[in-house]
Amino acid sequence: KSSSEATNITPKHNMKAFLDELKAENIKKFLHNFTQIPHLAGTEQNFQLAKQIQSQWKEFGLDSVELTHYDVLLSYPNKTHPNYISIINEDGNEIFNTSLFEPPPAGYENVSDIVPPFSAFSPQGMPEGDLVYVNYARTEDFFKLERDMKINCSGKIVIARYGKVFRGNKVKNAQLAGATGVILYSDPDDYFAPGVKSYPDGWNLPGGGVQRGNILNLNGAGDPLTPGYPANEYAYRRGMAEAVGLPSIPVHPIGYYDAQKLLEKMGGSASPDSSWRGSLKVPYNVGPGFTGNFSTQKVKMHIHSTSEVTRIYNVIGTLRGAVEPDRYVILGGHRDSWVFGGIDPQSGAAVVHEIVRSFGMLKKEGWRPRRTILFASWDAEEFGLLGSTEWAEENSRLLQERGVAYINADSSIEGNYTLRVDCTPLMYSLVYNLTKELESPDEGFEGKSLYESWTKKSPSPEFSGMPRISKLGSGNDFEVFFQRLGIASGRARYTKNWETNKFSSYPLYHSVYETYELVEKFYDPMFKYHLTVAQVRGGMVFELANSVVLPFDCRDYAVVLRKYADKIYNISMKHPQEMKTYSVSFDSLFSAVKNFTEIASKFSERLRDFDKSNPILLRMMNDQLMFLERAFIDPLGLPDRPFYRHVIYAPSSHNKYAGESFPGIYDALFDIESKVDPSQAWGEVKRQISIATFTVQAAAETLSEVA
């Protein structure tokens, strides 16, 4: 039976009814409810919230709502033995200690169980030594230090500013450079916007504010002790020495008041250029060690955190599809927070809650979606995307056969300037068409579409007149669905106008000051941006679950494949002599991309013209669309990253948050001029080109006529 037969109202009316039911006032109320106490993963408070959400989703009308639990490795500070950093004099006396906690915001002084700032999964240790300032601790920062400035970080404690890249990459880079410890701090240059006051008077980071966060390098593994398999009752667990992605050196985060005290004494080399200088009143000398009078003083870290296997809980709600119940569209976002989670994650969880309520209202009126919609409240995202990954590992066989799409729903806002979307190219047309139908919430765009304000404020860098849609990277719960399983995925949120700080978050990210009041007073008093995000996320889910033909356009993959092939070829052509010497050719890849383009166009023609009343044909065409993303998965995974299996996209090896195209080829080419064995290095480039070529060609074949 067709989609419209599955309901008592026409499909167009369904979508309007669904969107009209979404209310800003409800999102506001839900956000307030979710942010009154901390909901740290593995705690009783977060278990209670899981049960509350389960109960409310049932009330809203979902067919079933279950809790699924896993026992995963988490990390906590030692309550009786706090973490801190000191400056010690030649006698070993502590002459300065960093603060043990963030001053709580007004009204929250008596809240218990606020976890002090820490770097989750840091090993214990008390290293002491000279300090080296390493800027953002990016790959290029260490290249600058080691290759240009000839500064050796071996045996040193490094201090790095947060921002630009995922903190786990910073720690990995420091480890590889031989550091014995890492201090992470928030520089005002990255976390204090000019002309804005500190919290509670504005949305800027106060000097005592600190960003928490995990420092793992999991590369998609999930629970460090059970990579590839769910962390259930009968799971085999690795020993800690074999655990995936754990850092080997102590790490600790601090605020800029404390950072000032460490950085102001720095001596040694001057910073190489202005890009290494933040906005503290310090010289930003690189070191190693302190200057002149202070040269005998050292820095000492005191880290006593423990890692322990702890139970976590996901909430999984189901709204059964009327026509294709075995096809799943998933809307998921996490529930666990570092402290109150005013933005991350509860601004997203509140939107999911309202989307569930609206779908529930339609169901109570007799409507059902064509396909099954699964709603998820993930646990332990902050500890390495653990809840979503374990659930996907447990259900991988079902997901790879039945998963149509995954829409992520973490923080709804990271600013209030314009829309930000990252998604598979299959969803480009869906996103563009949907945003053309939605009203912009932006001032100065009254009566205009969201598409219009988005295009104006965030234009595509290569396609003028269109808005920017970015590649999916990682650092959020879509990772396992997209990068490991090859399920078409997307995410949307409202963002800031801060192009220069592309991967530096909003100032109060992961601090105690991320409260309900932060959102209600400074970011979205009318909750109109939250409502818009609910409409985008909900609208995408609605279309994906209810349209007769899946709203995927394979021609858009052809466009980006050409662009990515051009890009990687241009990178390779920086080495024309070696390309000649080692007979490196991209001809096969360009040929495969051309074949994909041709077959995708032919498929689109058939899609337009086939008999949509024939259920077998319809299912066949939809399956070709659903399985296209899956066709880009290499079962062997990327080199040394077996859980990143998508050949077209992977998280950057240098920044987990960013997406890289043709990552296998990109990584093989990266810094190739420094490789010891150029013949082997260029051989790997050729191998990666052949894998990419095969994958693109194989994906194209899945779109060919089946017989």
């Epitope: 480009y428 007149g465 991209f586 166009s601």
Partner: antibody, heavy 121, light 111 residues
Framework: EVQLVESGGGLVQPGGSLRLSCTAS????????MSWVRQAPGKGLEWVSA????????YYADTVKGRFTISRDNSKNTLYLQMNSLRAEDTAVYYC??????????????WGQGILVTVSS | QSVLTQPPSVSAAPGQKVTISCSGS????????VSWYQQLPGTAPKLLIF???KRPSGIPDRFSGSKSGTSATLGITGLQTGDEADYYC???????????FGTGTKVTVLG
């Protein structure tokens, strides 16, 4: 049989605007990249702009970037070229061309008859 | 200023063979497919060769294409008076993200 018919050309003053249209028939318009190619009097062919199949990603030659806008209406099987801030050197016969492969430009297997645009005061 | 270079003109007697070269770089001809177009006087261009060496239906096998490295060649054998026209090579340029045409070559049939 594929047919491409351009319209909207004519005489315009420097700094003025013009909108060219190209109506297509005989193939599934939405699946193919479409291009505009121009030829100044007595000169060679110059590719101006293309738009992909699918959602319609635009591409432009550096000479027209920021002044010309390509668009398509798949429901009307029509390709457009909005030309603003026209200059004397934009004077040419403008051809509409269909790609022979699919969603991005590879080669042009069908061409319109061309339309003359004259920019002069 | 075209990034693909062709000779301005070539000529030969009827029945003879002519070749037209098209020289580019690694970012265009080097890694992309070359096509050739014929433009008879006063008419729109017509596709002659695509994918370096393939002929659309209706194009006689007197016309052939080849590509080597960063250059492409169009060959016309058994030259006829009806072959008098301008010929253009064209390809995608991966660095410019743009389509590029050659400077064009005028073929004259002598006598």
């Amino acid at each position: 049989e594929v047919q491409l018919v351009e319209s909207g050309g004519g005489l315009v003053q420097p700094g003025g605007s013009l909108r060219l249209s190209c109506t297509a028939s005989g193939f599934i318009f939405s699946s193919y990249a479409m291009s505009w190619v121009r030829q100044a009097p007595g000169k060679g062919l110059e590719w101006v702009s293309a738009i992909s199949g699918g959602y319609g990603a635009p591409y432009y030659a550096d000479t027209v970037k920021g002044r010309f806008t390509i668009s398509r209406d798949n429901s009307k099987n029509t390709l457009y070229l909005q030309m603003n801030s026209l200059r004397a050197e934009d004077t040419a016969v403008y051809y509409c061309a269909k790609d022979g492969v699919g969603a991005t430009p590879y080669y042009f297997d069908d061409w319109g008859q061309g339309i003359l645009v004259t920019v002069s005061s | 200023q075209s990034v693909l270079t062709q000779p301005p003109s070539v000529s030969a007697a009827p029945g003879q063979k002519v070749t037209i070269s098209c020289s580019g770089s690694s970012s265009n001809i080097g890694n992309n497919y070359v096509s050739w177009y014929q433009q008879l006087p006063g008419t729109a261009p017509k596709l002659l060769i695509f994918d370096n060496n393939k002929r659309p239906s209706g194009i006689p096998d007197r016309f052939s294409g080849s590509k080597s490295g960063t250059s492409a060649t169009l060959g016309i054998t058994g030259l006829q008076t009806g072959d008098e026209a301008d010929y253009y090579c064209g390809t995608w340029d991966s660095s410019l993200s743009a389509y590029v045409f050659g400077t064009g070559t005028k073929v004259t049939v002598l006598g």
